[in-house]
């Protein structure tokens, strides 16, 4: 029977660094190794018929134990695929591999309005681009952390918000008097140090009402 | 045939560093990664980490991360392994192996001992 | 990361006896578990892999068997040089060894 496995499922390096993804087979009188690259919607052919692609090739280098990266960058994250089949045969195993490339997070930019309308629903955004893996993010108001629920601490007991970690959107509905305060956001991915935004003050505004 | 041929025993004191080298032959060296594996007397066996010699990219054990270093001369086909900060629980055997997926080589072991 | 539960930690036996180890995993490892022969002063000699590939050389009287979590080394009729440390490796996910069994005379 063919095997086709790698002890390295999951491989995290820092960016540019050197890697190898693994891929060690049995079972092949005359093994074909293939290895593709999936990222979302991409795919690429890094390796085809033992030899490094020419798109990897200044970069990538096949070995009969898998494939070593001189030095990687953060568009190299994804899942990549060990295929092997017998040459001229019907054997054949495959083995995904997925790497992450460690980026630390940049400084987050916050979109935040400096006046609100109480009553009203009022959405602060926050995100940074570099992280990976992709940043979580922490918001706070007047330096304090503001918990994922509101009612949970007496200090936003007041607040009604809704607050994504994963898409750093902070949505008030319906903003409160009491929202009014001092925020700024904090992204981190579990690599390098967490980067904090600037802080921008919000208003919470009385409902202009006409004579 | 292949071989991996290490390095002497060390007698090392508390705070210091050793240095253990695994000479490889019989097979072509930058095509495996080199793993190191720790025996404490009349212990069972403890995987350190591994370099890839033909890039140099390594991985270490949690356990080790931070006091051990593994690199590779690939103009001599020696895999090194030091360990820094030594304390006395370090007395013990430490070996090279190669990875296939598993281990199917291994050095004849190298007895380091940290004493005052 | 993948704990390997390794027993018993000693054994003893006689010339003959059919003797078994067993390795447990804490999570199925797919049938990537090795096993290697320790005597003293010796280093780790590999006698199984893929649960039950016997490596060349080594004499039929050993065997691998397992899925999953839980695996078996047998050695079917104890020979004199088989008194030694019996080890398990798993594979699967990065590289972890069992505890050691050592199989000693009666």
């Known amino acids: 029977s063919v095997t086709v496995h790698s002890s390295e499922p999951e491989v995290r390096i820092p960016e540019n660094n050197p890697v190898k993804l693994s891929c060690a087979y049995s079972g092949f009188s005359s093994p074909r190794v293939e290895w593709k690259f999936d990222q979302g919607d991409t795919t690429r052919l890094v390796c085809y018929n033992n030899k490094i692609t020419a798109s990897y090739e200044d970069r990538v280098t096949f070995l009969p134990t898998g494939i070593t990266f001189k030095s990687v960058t953060r568009e190299d994250t994804g899942t990549y695929t060990c295929m092997v089949s017998e040459e001229g045969g019907n054997s054949y195993g495959e083995v995904k591999v997925k790497l992450i490339v460690l980026v630390p997070p940049s400084k987050p930019t916050v979109n935040i309005p400096s006046s609100a309308t109480i009553g009203n629903r009022a959405v602060l955004t926050c995100s940074e681009q570099d992280g990976s893996p992709p940043s979580e993010y922490t918001w706070f108001k007047d330096g304090i952390v503001m918990p994922t629920n509101p009612k949970s601490t007496r200090a936003f007991s007041n607040s009604s918000y809704v607050l994504n970690p994963t898409t750093g959107e902070l949505v008030f509905d319906p903003l409160s008097a009491s929202d009014t305060g001092e925020y700024s956001c904090e992204a981190r991915n579990g690599y390098g140090t967490p980067m904090t935004s600037n802080a921008v003050r919000m208003e919470a505004v009385e409902r202009n009402v006409g004579v | 045939e292949v071989q991996l041929v290490q390095s002497g025993a060390e007698v090392k004191k508390p705070g210091a560093s050793v240095k253990v080298s695994c000479k490889a032959s019989?097979?072509?060296?930058?095509?495996?990664?080199m793993h190191w594996v720790q025996q404490a007397p009349g212990q069972g066996l403890e995987w350190m980490g591994y370099?890839?010699?033909?890039?140099?990219?390594?991985r270490y054990s949690e356990k080790f991360q931070g006091r051990v270093t593994i690199t590779a001369d690939t103009s001599t086909d020696t895999a090194y392994m030091e360990l820094s900060s030594l304390r006395s629980e370090d007395t013990a055997v430490y070996y090279c192996?190669?990875?296939?997926?598993?281990?199917?080589?291994w050095g004849q072991g190298t007895l380091v001992t940290v004493s005052s | 990361d993948i704990q390997m539960t390794q027993s018993p930690f000693s054994l003893s036996a006689s010339v003959g006896d059919r003797v078994t180890i067993t390795c447990q995993a804490s999570?199925?490892?797919?049938?990537?578990i090795a096993w290697y022969q320790q005597k003293p002063a010796k280093a780790p000699k590999l006698f199984i892999h893929?649960?039950?590939t016997l490596e060349s050389g080594v004499p039929s009287r050993f065997s691998g068997s397992g899925s999953g979590t839980d695996y078996t080394l047998t050695i079917s009729s104890l020979q004199p040089e088989d008194f030694a440390t019996y080890y398990c490796?798993?594979?699967?996910?990065?590289?972890?060894f069992g505890q050691g069994t050592k199989v000693e005379i009666k």
């Open positions: 370099i890839d010699p033909y890039n140099g990219g390594t």
């Open positions: 999570q199925d490892i797919n049938n990537y």
């Open positions: 192996a190669r990875q296939t997926d598993y281990f199917d080589y």
């Open positions: 019989g097979y072509s060296f930058t095509d495996y990664s």
């Open positions: 490796l798993q594979y699967d996910n990065l590289w972890t």
């Open positions: 893929y649960t039950s």
